[in-house]
Interface confidence: low
């Protein structure tokens, strides 16, 4: 008889999760020479150790420390790109602007991007049926705690001018409850980060409003300024043209700062 399993509100662990993580790790270390020293089996073991046989609503950042240690990576100053609610464009950007990095361009972010996982208390099994939902079940679940942990670390290690891409189509352009608003903003280090530059991405071609004047952006500016970090904001009215010019900066039509 199949043993009883806790039913959570969220979708279960991504199919072939261990194989996916291991394969991504191997691929990443092959492509990034500075990470060639990483032993992917050890990475998987550390990843697995963070959540296997643990109650999936009682995961802590401490659980992920062995993994974080193995995945230690630094981003050059001025090259960190944070994002909130606009992941696809941020990733399209760093795919072209290869010297800038989102969290998902780093090893740990790359391993976990778009995946779901959880285990069960006192068994070595992975739960492929359901996992805790952040709202309906609990916030201290394996996936949420992972992203909180690596996002905190990513922000803590940033230096120089940090950029953040924000979605100008949302009612809250800056959302204090997002990972960016609740974790990354508060973990930028004023002694290392001289400025945060927000890029507000416009959704509509006819939209010429200055979204840098949006009340939520002013709120972000206030939070950042109180932390003794300078704040700048730019409207990106034409994200399609923005990417086009990142691809072809030598095009005479693209002689503009981003």
């Amino acid at each position: 008889l199949p043993r009883w399993r806790q039913q959570w509100s969220g979708s279960g662990t991504t199919s072939r999760f261990p194989e996916t993580v291991l394969a991504r790790c191997v691929k990443y270390t092959e492509v990034h020479p500075e990470m060639r020293h990483v032993d992917c089996q050890s990475v998987w073991d550390a990843f697995k150790g963070a959540f296997i046989s643990k109650y999936p609503c009682n995961i802590t950042e401490e659980d992920y420390q062995p993994l974080v240690k193995l995945g230690t990576q630094t981003v050059p100053c001025n090259k960190t790109l944070l994002w909130s609610r606009i992941k696809d464009l941020a990733h399209q950007f760093t795919q072209v602007q290869r010297d800038m990095f989102t969290l998902e361009d780093m090893l740990l972010g790359y391993l976990a991007d778009d995946l779901t996982w959880c285990g069960e208390f006192n068994t070595f099994e992975i739960n492929y049926q359901s996992c805790p939902d952040w709202r309906k079940d609990c916030s201290n679940n394996p996936v949420s705690v992972f992203w909180k942990t690596v996002s905190r670390r990513f922000a803590e290690t940033a230096c120089g001018v940090v950029h953040v891409m924000l979605n100008g189509s949302r009612s809250k352009i800056f959302d204090k409850n997002s990972t960016f608003g609740s974790v990354e903003v508060h973990n930028l280090q004023p002694e290392k980060v001289q400025a945060l530059e927000a890029w507000v991405i416009h959704g509509g071609r006819e939209d010429s409003r200055d979204l840098c004047q949006d009340p939520t952006i002013k709120e972000l500016e206030s939070i950042i300024s109180k932390r003794n970090i300078r704040f700048f904001c730019k409207n990106i009215y034409r994200p399609d043209k923005f990417l086009q010019c990142v691809k072809n900066p030598e095009d005479s039509s693209c002689l503009s700062g981003i």
């Epitope: 010429s208 730019k234 409207n235 009215y237 700062g257």
Partner: antibody, heavy 123, light 111 residues
Amino acid sequence: EVQLLESGGGLVQPGGSLRLSCAASGFTFDDYGMSWVRQAPGKGLEWVSDISWNGGKTHYVDSVKGQFTISRDNSKNTLYLQMNSLRAEDTAVYYCARGSLFHDSSGFYFGHWGQGTLVTVSS
Amino acid sequence: QSVLTQPPSASGTPGQRVTISCSGSSSNIGDNYVSWYQQLPGTAPKLLIYRDSQRPSGVPDRFSGSKSGTSASLAISGLRSEDEADYYCQSYDSSLSGSVFGGGTKLTVLG
């Protein structure tokens, strides 16, 4: 090939008005911010005004605020500068210049220029 | 009085290296990109340098730009007689919400 062709300059008395035009070709006009830059005889360049790709945002140098109006007609690929209450100090060659794709970016500068049209304000 | 400050003149002999400075403040050069333009006598300005140090295609690599803090400079190496022109620096000024130019530097190639 990008081309910008200014017209509408000439001799005008103090207090008079002129409307400059800049006909653009060789690129998608409504993708770009545009500017007017002037140069008084024997002097340096002075940025006058700029307008965003869809006309939604305009800026002016303090000395012409309330006096000049920048506009554009994207259906005609044309940029305009309406100049009222002209003074002797407005005498200059006026250049139309193509700015950046992202109007308020910190890199708003000018990759292409027209040959300029001379405005002379004198009685 | 220009917002950005340039020396009114500079000179050099063919083959020499000449540097033109451009000084501003935190609201323009300090926070924003600098570009440089060359204006030959009787012609419209031409973009030489953008984004502080980038050259548009077609501009010889004898021209280079750099920036430090609130100052920028244009260097011309291997000076040629055809480089004799007026040179202008330009930036965006965040507090003025507009572009600003330097007063221009007249470069004379001697001999």
